[in-house]
């Protein structure tokens, strides 16, 4: 499973509003939804290998 909570900033432009914690921006419907509804990477314990290396999250990502 690659689902799990991740606090992402909102993607609803032109003036992006941050999603609240535990919500993620759904690019396909253009609004914030519960992160568990999207297949986002589950944060791993320190030292655990990740299925895909992720760049640091950028603002509004």
């Amino acid at each position: 499973m690659r689902r799990g909570p991740r606090s992402l900033r909102g993607r609803d432009a032109p003036a992006p509003t941050p999603c609240v914690p535990a919500e993620c921006f759904d690019l396909l419907v253009a609004h914030c939804v519960a992160c568990g509804l999207l297949r986002t990477p589950r944060p791993k314990p320190a030292g655990a290998s990740s299925p895909a290396p992720r760049t640091a999250l950028q603002p509004q990502e």
Partner: antibody, heavy 118, light 113 residues
Framework: DVQLQESGPSLVKPSQTLSLTCSVT????????WNWIRKFPGNKLEYMGY???????YYNPSLKSRISITRDTSKNQFYLQLLSVTTEDTATYYC????????????WGAGTLVTVSS | DIVMTQTPLSLPVSLGDQASISCRSS???????????LHWYLQKPGQSPKLLIY???NRFSGVPDRFSGSGSGTDFTLKISRVEAEDLGVYFC??????????FGSGTKLEIK
């Protein structure tokens, strides 16, 4: 690991309905977007549509009203139906899962070749 | 829909050579959030497509560093610094900025010269 597997008939007659199943293991289809993509002879990839975590659907307008994507959450499967097929629908059909952070297709089925011929 | 134009359609190379594939989009792929959702996939013979590069320049897990992606706006490039036999196949660019529908380039077949 998430795995997807397409199944269904490899030969369909013109004017009939193409029906495929995508079986998902390692993740729940009640999370994310689950997609159908096809590849024509000659390498063209066409995005067909999705069914979402909520059960909402999107269909590529190029397929008009011929396409239907449904799901059975109890079986963790989703389905493609393409009505009134012609030889132009001969293609390899893939189901794929969508990463919800960077929005790429991170997991694909092996694909199934469907030939439309009488 | 966004049209993705890939060149060349066929790319004959010698092993060890550098290869370069271009992808151009009919509109800028910079999303209003500032991100550019341009990805590259490789489909090896008999396999399904596999992600190589996401968001223009980020290598996916397990992808060798001889693969690199660059570009911005509407013009993007995938480079392979030293082609190996296992790199042969069809390369596709794809955009997830203006979706749905997701759209793909026409594909570039990398083959041995």
């Amino acid at each position: 690991d998430v795995q997807l597997q397409e199944s269904g008939p490899s030969l369909v007659k013109p004017s009939q309905t193409l029906s495929l199943t995508c079986s998902v293991t390692g993740d729940s289809i009640t999370s994310g977007y689950w997609n159908w993509i096809r590849k024509f002879p000659g390498n063209k990839l066409e995005y067909m549509g999705y069914i979402s975590y909520s059960g909402s659907t999107y269909y590529n307008p190029s397929l008009k009203s011929r396409i239907s994507i449904t799901r059975d959450t109890s079986k963790n499967q989703f389905y493609l139906q393409l009505l009134s097929v012609t030889t132009e629908d001969t293609a390899t059909y893939y189901c794929a899962g969508l990463d919800g952070l960077y929005w790429y297709f991170d997991v694909w089925g092996a694909g199934t070749l469907v030939t439309v011929s009488s | 829909d966004i049209v993705m134009t890939q060149t060349p359609l066929s790319l004959p190379v010698s092993l060890g050579d550098q290869a370069s594939i271009s992808c151009r989009s009919s509109q800028s792929l910079v999303h209003s959030n500032g991100n550019t959702y341009l990805h590259w996939y490789l489909q090896k013979p008999g396999q399904s497509p596999k992600l190589l590069i996401y968001k223009v320049s980020n290598r996916f897990s397990g992808v060798p560093d001889r693969f690199s992606g660059s570009g911005s706006g509407t013009d993007f490039t995938l480079k392979i610094s030293r082609v190996e036999a296992e790199d042969l196949g069809v390369y596709f660019c794809s955009q997830s900025t203006h979706v749905p529908p997701f759209t793909f380039g026409s594909g570039t077949k990398l083959e041995i010269k």
